[in-house]
């Protein structure tokens, strides 16, 4: 138990903690006053974003455009960066005042809308140190954290949470499913100084836990004892042959026998056809391979379990969560089918503020976005039905014309004339 716990025990201290929003842990005691907003981007100033975001200098990379897409909740508020060219790499980044998350919570949040019904493409962000050359950001550029949805074919529909730990990108051991519909979704990553994390989609928790448990940052705490090996006489057989069981004397019968009912055909010529042999049939008395009865093995010791020892290589690291320097947020993606819109970027140290910001942005426009999409779908259905009706009408008309063309020409006569004609002929 930490001495801090003793230090902070006393009347009304919980209230003080609440009022001052103090968070404390065994390793760190820190005050969290006003939320620090390190980066926020909502694209509300028209083309202003072009001066804040830097593109990689490469002609064959895809272009981002400012758009709210084909459907939206609010045309202005829902404007974001949209990928606009199919089968392209995209590289765009924005810098901010460098900061360290040591001793404090880190929250990364943004919205993604795959309105193109994405088949293969990234929807994730990367947080880089400020040492990144933004004009040369690429797939191998070293980042601190990569977070967000990724879809590619039927096999990949996941939320990546990757930390660069001691120079190596370490993937989460859990499978977090991302949203794969056409609507805007809010993705949030929370990393806390007690080495815990939380992933939220649409402001609801989808995963949480400890960094040490859910990533392979550190060697395992326990390893198999290298000096231990299964004893020679360790018997893992649960059942053995009954030594008292023996094969019955009449057991061995051939599998096939000559058909006793078969007769040599009368026209069989031994000189021409060779010696006649009756066809063989399955022997009804054949019993197959004899196997002795199985009994419980009196020497059975169970499955040998390799004993484990403390791993001498293991030592805990209370600062897995911490990075000295965050300075750039980047979109470094590949998209087969373009159309994804990124918006409402936020990097802060305050979970409550992030949730509030999510509710005030994504939360406010999501219902109207769905409404507009539903309306468009309904209109499309109606148009499709109208087109189908028109097509059917045209087909019927064409069929009638064809029938008229095909049938032999008859003189047009009134019914009365035709009937009279019939009588006369009769």
């Amino acid at each position: 138990s930490s001495s801090l716990e003793v230090l902070f025990q006393g009347p009304g201290l919980n209230d003080i903690f609440e009022a001052q929003k103090i968070e404390w842990h065994e390793e760190n005691l820190y005050f969290q006053g006003e939320p620090a907003v390190y980066f926020k981007e909502q694209f509300l100033d028209g083309d202003g974003w072009t001066s804040r975001w830097i593109e990689k200098h490469k002609s064959d990379f895809g272009k981002f455009v400012l758009s709210s897409g084909k459907f939206y909740g609010d045309e202005e508020k829902d404007k974001g960066l949209q990928t606009s060219q199919d089968a392209r790499f995209y590289a765009l980044s924005a810098s901010f005042e460098p900061f360290s998350n040591k001793g404090q919570t880190l929250v990364v949040q943004f919205t993604v809308k795959h309105e193109q019904n994405i088949d293969c493409g990234g929807g994730y962000v990367k947080l880089f140190p400020n040492s990144l050359d933004q004009t040369d950001m690429h797939g191998d550029s070293e980042y601190n954290i990569m977070f967000g949805p990724d879809i590619c074919g039927p096999g990949t529909k996941k939320v990546h949470v990757i930390f660069n730990y001691k120079g190596k990108n370490v993937l989460i051991n859990k499978d977090i499913r991302c949203k794969d519909d056409e609507f805007t979704h809010l993705y949030t990553l929370i990393v806390r100084p007690d080495n815990t994390y939380e992933v939220k989609i649409d402001n609801s928790q989808v995963e949480s836990g400890s960094l040490e448990d859910d990533w392979d940052f550190l060697p395992p705490k326990k390893i198999k004892d290298p000096d231990a090996s299964k004893p020679e006489d360790w018997d893992e057989r649960a059942k053995i042959d009954d030594p008292t069981d023996s094969k019955p004397e009449d057991w061995d019968k051939p599998e096939h026998i000559p058909d006793p009912d078969a007769k040599k055909p009368e026209d069989w010529d031994e000189e021409m056809d060779g010696e006649w042999e009756p066809p063989v049939i399955q022997n009804p008395e054949y019993k197959g391979e004899w196997k002795p009865r199985q009994i419980d093995n009196p020497d059975y010791k169970g499955t040998w379990i390799h004993p484990e020892i403390d791993n001498p290589e293991y030592s805990p690291d209370p600062s897995i969560y911490a990075y000295d320097n965050f300075g750039v947020l980047g979109l470094d993606l590949w998209q087969v089918k373009s159309g994804t819109i990124f918006d409402n970027f936020l990097i802060t140290n305050d979970e409550a503020y992030a949730e509030e910001f999510g509710n005030e942005t994504w939360g406010v426009t999501k219902a109207a976005e769905k409404q507009m999409k539903d309306k468009q779908d309904e209109e499309q259905r109606t148009r499709r039905m109208m087109r189908t009706k028109m097509r059917m009408r045209r087909m019927r008309r064409t069929r009638r014309k064809m029938r008229r063309k095909m049938s032999p020409a008859r003189p047009r006569t009134s019914c009365r004339e035709a009937c009279l004609q019939g009588w006369t002929e009769a």
Epitope: A87, C120, G122, D140, G155, T156, W334
Partner: antibody, heavy 127, light 107 residues
């Protein structure tokens, strides 16, 4: 799991080109990435390049840039490797190898290693 | 360009532990894969991402990676483990293989 079957052995003249095919079965072709690796007699493995069919783009080892073309035909689930301006040093066994896509970036393919290999195609370059 | 260095050969007595190393500048920051290749056959992936075993690969095969050296460890070596072993990494959008190590199981 995907299986990879390569085309048969080839004997080529110096200066000519060779095109080796690698047909995938037993999996969704677009969910895999294909690499081409060669091995000269008595030598080690050498990566030539790779393609992710769903991307439609290939990337190549610097050594082979301009001389190798890797393509994929999704309709027949077949990847191809064409090597031009052949010389005697190109005599080798050429392997295609695949790994399942785990994401939309190039690095995902290589992050998990190449877990399925073709049987190899022997290409002999001799005058 | 990035280089991986492997010893040309390693010998081990049956039942003992063989260790094959793969050296590279700060290799510990990269993901290392190991392949086994028997004469006349295609390579087989035995370890991916430093220490993960694909299904069907015996537990006797393990891997580690830190600093400037990655290691493939084969415990309780058997005659059937005799093969060439290659390490591999991904660096600067390129796949790099080590030169290979011939493992001989004595006896």
């Amino acid at each position: 799991e995907v299986q990879l079957v390569q085309s048969g052995a080839e004997v080529k003249k110096p200066g000519s080109s060779v095109k080796v095919s690698c047909k995938a079965s037993g999996g969704t072709f677009s969910s895999y990435a294909i690499s081409w690796v060669r091995q000269a007699p008595g030598q080690g493995l050498e990566w030539m390049g790779g393609i992710i069919p769903i991307f439609g783009t290939a990337n190549y080892a610097q050594k082979f840039q301009g001389r190798v073309t890797i393509t994929a035909d999704e309709s027949t689930s077949t990847a191809y490797m064409e090597l031009s301006s052949l010389r005697s040093e190109d005599t080798a066994v050429y392997y295609c190898a695949s790994s399942p896509l785990r994401g939309s970036g190039w690095y995902w393919h290589y992050y998990y290693g190449m877990d399925v290999w073709g049987q190899g195609t022997t290409v002999t370059v001799s005058s | 360009s990035y280089e991986l260095t492997q010893p040309p050969s390693v010998s081990v007595a049956p039942g003992k532990t063989a260790r094959i190393t793969c050296g590279g500048n700060k290799i510990g920051t990269k993901s290392v894969h190991w392949y086994q290749q028997k004469p006349g056959q295609a390579p087989v992936l035995v370890i991916y991402r430093d220490s993960n075993r694909p299904s069907g690969i015996p537990e006797r095969f393990s891997g580690s990676n830190s600093g400037n050296t990655a290691t493939l460890t084969i415990s309780r070596a058997q005659a059937g483990d005799e093969a060439d072993y290659y390490c591999q990494v991904w660096d600067s959008s390129t796949v790099v293989f080590g030169g290979g190590t011939k493992l001989t199981v004595l006896g």
